[in-house]
Amino acid sequence: SSVRTWSPNSAVNPHTVPPACPEPQGCYLELEFLYPLVPESLTIWVTFVSTDWDSSGAVNDIKLLAVSGKNISLGPQNVFCDVPLTIRLWDVGEEVYGIQIYTLDEHLEIDAAMLTSTADTPLCLQCKPLKYKVVRDPPLQMDVASILHLNRKFVDMDLNLGSVYQYWVITISGTEESEPSPAVTYIHGSGYCGDGIIQKDQGEQCDDMNKINGDGCSLFCRQEVSFNCIDEPSRCYFHDGDGVCEEFEQKTSIKDCGVYTPQGFLDQWASNASVSHQDQQCPGWVIIGQPAASQVCRTKVIDLSEGISQHAWYPCTISYPYSQLAQTTFWLRAYFSQPMVAAAVIVHLVTDGTYYGDQKQETISVQLLDTKDQSHDLGLHVLSCRNNPLIIPVVHDLSQPFYHSQAVRVSFSSPLVAISGVALRSFDNFDPVTLSSCQRGETYSPAEQSCVHFACEK
């Protein structure tokens, strides 16, 4: 671990110290900036992320520390080592003096963080505009104006077809020069990211002729999540929630297409329900049937009175402080009209039980109840809006007989959890219980969903 970076593990001996960032809070790095300012963006340079975390779980929250005393949570972030994380902060609107970066990855390395002010900040009145210098390999001819002042466009006219060129940009501030930027490689005559033509052989999924993230086509010409890009140059639109169910979003957009059921499976939504805590403000029956597609899962919600009870059940009869001290267990039982051999249980969330005052992620315990009223434990599962709906696979012990499940019991310990639906996923046209009961001379008929007599023809 480099002395120029911060890592939770940089100060511990891996042989004697347990993991440094245990769930749920993890570790955090607090950084303060020299000048408090109203930010336009925050940029963080990460130099190492454990492979266990991929890019999605390493930074589980970033908090802006405001001069007013407010802590503004930006939530979990995807981080990569090859490109800095930049978060636009258009609507913060107040002075920020520092940040806290939370991580569950004890090996995460953070190199630097930069808070960029909004335009016309008083601190910048004395500043001179930055200049940029373009460097090329092979080198540019001496007479080429490679220093750019206010215009940020450089045109290279001295190129040979098929030749390979590398370009770097250096920032000049006064007499100081920055490190060169990462190189861009260009073969004259072939395409590149930003030319408006999609070079699939170079891994491009789109090309909108710019290098901006967040517009549907990323800096690296990759299509961004929840966008669809068409044509050349690419025109990208945010499809998730536009009311149109398009083929490519059937698996991902609950808002447009409802819940996706894979081929060969059948999803049954609860036909009845009972809950541990309810009154007129939080009746249990709202979880019956398929969840409303309009209900987006929200994290860090502490006020569940805002219309949530029309679409989801949450335990509204006791307060959060009481429930935490008393370690109350809340539960719901979802009943299904057609008992089936379960392949999975699906739990739909409207809130995931997190709140700004606690880094802890809520968990649920799930049990299947069979037709003989036996309970089958499916274990403990972490709730997160980023993993919604929660799909819990059912692993069957093949040394035991299969069983039909008629209900699901979900239990948890926070009244800030709101559940909008529970489904039992089973095999379509295939029932292992019936199949295993077929006698000699019988075979299972998927069409009849029963055992039928058959005779071998010689």
Epitope: I302, S319, Y320, P321, Q324, L325, Q327
Partner: antibody
Framework: QLQLQESGPGLVKPSETLSLTCTVS??????????WGWIRQPPGKGLEWIGS???????YYNPSLKSRVTISVDTSKNQFSLKLSSVTAADTAVYYC???????????WGQGTLVTVSS | DIQMTQSPSSVSASVGDRVTITCRAS??????LAWYQQKPGKAPKLLIY???SVQSGVPSRFSGSGSGTDFTLTISSLQPEDFATYYC?????????FGGGTKVEIK
Amino acid sequence: QLQLQESGPGLVKPSETLSLTCTVSGGSISSSDYYWGWIRQPPGKGLEWIGSIFYSGSTYYNPSLKSRVTISVDTSKNQFSLKLSSVTAADTAVYYCARATTSSSADYWGQGTLVTVSS
Amino acid sequence: DIQMTQSPSSVSASVGDRVTITCRASQGISRWLAWYQQKPGKAPKLLIYAASSVQSGVPSRFSGSGSGTDFTLTISSLQPEDFATYYCQQGNVPPLTFGGGTKVEIK
């Protein structure tokens, strides 16, 4: 009728530890429908919740006082206690103990005891 | 922490008047709001819990309403014994916090 009674010294020296006990009578501290708390009110000022405890011993402290506060419970004596360390003049207040319901509102209060921090 | 802001900080009223005190939370607190009455030298007394439920033994002239961030305590016809300071308190998430108080004085 449930009653709560605070007891403890009325004068504490700066940097010392303030210790108060709340005795509950007319009901059990071990009821699972309630939790117990300490609230204080500096002279002429508003109310501040110090912290809470359940009969099982689980606690929650106000973050502004967390480093200095300990609340404990003794179910055999039907009592719960407050310790506030490293006190200063700013800790001079009337200290109340109270019972909190499932809605986190305090339905029964002690009559309060004035604690003055002075040398 | 959730800040509770009460208004007005004091109100002068006469016996028989209708008095309304408001309490605003810095974030939504669902229905977890309580109202207390405190007289000089006495402990606070619970009037309303869960925003609108009247505590047993409290006169029916006291009522509470609201949800989310805005709440109201109403005394429909002020009585001589109602001159006191009133506090709101949120019980949605810890730490539990109180409003600054509203003093109801005789006009």
